[in-house]
Interface confidence: low
């Protein structure tokens, strides 16, 4: 056979990934691999992840002769050991006026009155602790509640009898109930005055309010 058909172990080099070929015999060779590779032709990237020091739930990502930690959002650093200050990163981490407090591995919100939840986004149901009179409807508000009274009832908690029920205001006057004491308030039409809007007005003074 001609010389061009002779097998030369290192020509071309069978070593990959930057490995250096060394002829060890007429038909044998040895690859000296770069750090991070192994195998007879340096074909395998060594899995460095078993050598990990990823802390706090970090996930190891293999590289060439090294590894990195993919950290959960609340941790940072090469090995996920450094606490992320969520309060700096997310100025709006706490809603509705809540105050952000950084903690190791997370953060907490100190909510203002009327709000709750991890990020203070939940309006506290004040109706759960309200004392609206049975038969009335409670409406939740921020840090408060209001009672919607059925016909015939009045007051903040609907615990008073509605004085307007007996139509005490005359001459087409508007009747309103004082929510504090249940008494009626007449708003008189033009030309009338008095607690019940029964008195004529000399001059054209309009819309007199009278409480009773």
């Amino acid at each position: 056979a001609g010389s061009d058909s002779l097998y030369v172990p290192c020509a071309p080099s069978p070593c990959v990934n930057g490995g250096t070929c060394r002829q060890t015999g007429d038909f044998t060779f040895e690859c000296n691999c770069l750090p991070g590779f192994e195998g007879s032709t340096c074909e395998r990237n060594i899995d460095d992840c078993p050598n990990h020091r990823c802390q706090n739930g970090g996930v190891c990502v293999d590289g060439v002769n090294t590894y990195n930690c993919r950290c959960p959002p609340q941790w940072t650093g090469q090995f996920c050991t450094e606490d992320v200050d969520e309060c700096l990163l997310q100025p709006n981490a706490c809603q509705n006026g809540g105050t952000c407090a950084n903690r190791n591995g997370g953060y907490g919100c100190v909510c203002v009155n009327g709000w709750s939840g991890d990020d203070c986004s939940e309006n506290i149901d004040d109706c759960a602790f309200a004392s609206c009179t049975p038969g009335s409807t409670c409406i939740d508000r921020v840090a408060s509640f209001s009672c919607m009274c059925p016909e015939g009832k009045a007051g903040l908690l609907c615990h008073l009898d509605d004085a307007c029920i007996s139509n005490p205001c005359h001459k087409g006057a508007l009747c309103d109930t004082n929510p504090l004491n249940g008494q009626y308030i007449c708003t008189c039409p033009q030309g009338y005055k008095g607690a019940d809007c029964t008195e004529d007005v000399d001059e054209g003074n309009s819309h007199h309010h009278h409480h009773h």
Epitope: G36, D48, P50, Q78
Partner: antibody, heavy 117, light 112 residues
């Protein structure tokens, strides 16, 4: 071949300072954590702390925090464990170990530190 | 810290017989990455500990196949299937799932 070679045995008096060394070879020194493990006479090993040679970052067992410092000289692939003021209770065998498989794979031969007045 | 409890403290076994060492952790050693970082070491007098088994059941290079590891969660076992004279040593388990890494108290294996 991965090797960790530690400095020789030391006999010191309480209050003295000491720096022991651990030289790594046969691997890329910067890519692996170096640990220090203490073993008191007749007791089991205790993990003391580690150093990340690439960044110089250290992490300690709370039990040993403030008692010793760990440092590294990448140029000579050597890690150190150092005390500024030794106590009798520091008497122990100290091993350096290289990270591997999530454990301590390769160990130095150990440095015996004896603190006695 | 995670407490690693080994049993028994010492064990005397006839040559060629099976030796079993147990290690229990105070909480699960399953890491969030799915691995369980529980390892076994052998230490002979005047020598550093030597890694035998890593991550429950993987024999480290050069370790004879008479050494095997098993277990999951919080309970783990090192088995020497046929004790040899050179196996006389103290055996330690180590967890490195949780910070800080903690060793068991050790089990001394002797020949009966």
């Amino acid at each position: 071949e991965v090797q960790l070679v530690q400095s020789g045995a030391e006999v010191k008096k309480p209050g003295e300072s000491l720096k022991i060394s651990c030289k790594g070879s046969g691997y890329t020194f910067s890519n692996y954590v170096i640990h220090w493990v203490r073993q008191m006479p007749g007791k089991g090993p205790e993990w003391t702390g580690y150093i990340i040679p690439g960044s110089g970052g250290t992490k300690f067992n709370e039990k040993f925090k403030g008692q010793a410092t760990i440092s590294v000289d990448k140029s000579i692939t050597t890690a150190y464990l150092q005390w500024s003021s030794l106590k009798a209770s520091d008497t122990a065998m100290y091993y350096c170990a290289r990270d591997g498989a999530g454990s301590f794979t390769y160990w130095g031969q150990g440095t015996l530190v004896t603190v006695s007045s | 810290d995670i407490v690693m409890t080994q049993s028994p403290d010492s064990l005397a076994v006839s040559l060629g017989e099976r030796a079993t060492i147990n290690c229990r952790s105070s909480q699960s050693l399953v890491h969030s990455d799915g691995n369980t970082y529980l390892h076994w070491y052998q230490q002979k007098p005047g020598q550093p500990p030597k890694l035998l088994i890593y991550r429950i059941s993987n024999r480290f290079s050069g370790v004879p196949d008479r050494f095997s590891g098993s277990g999951s969660g919080t309970d783990f076992t090192l088995t020497i299937s046929s004790l040899q004279a050179e196996d006389v040593a103290v055996y330690y388990c180590l967890q490195s799932t949780h910070f800080p890494d903690t060793f068991g108290g050790g089990t001394k294996v002797e020949i009966k």
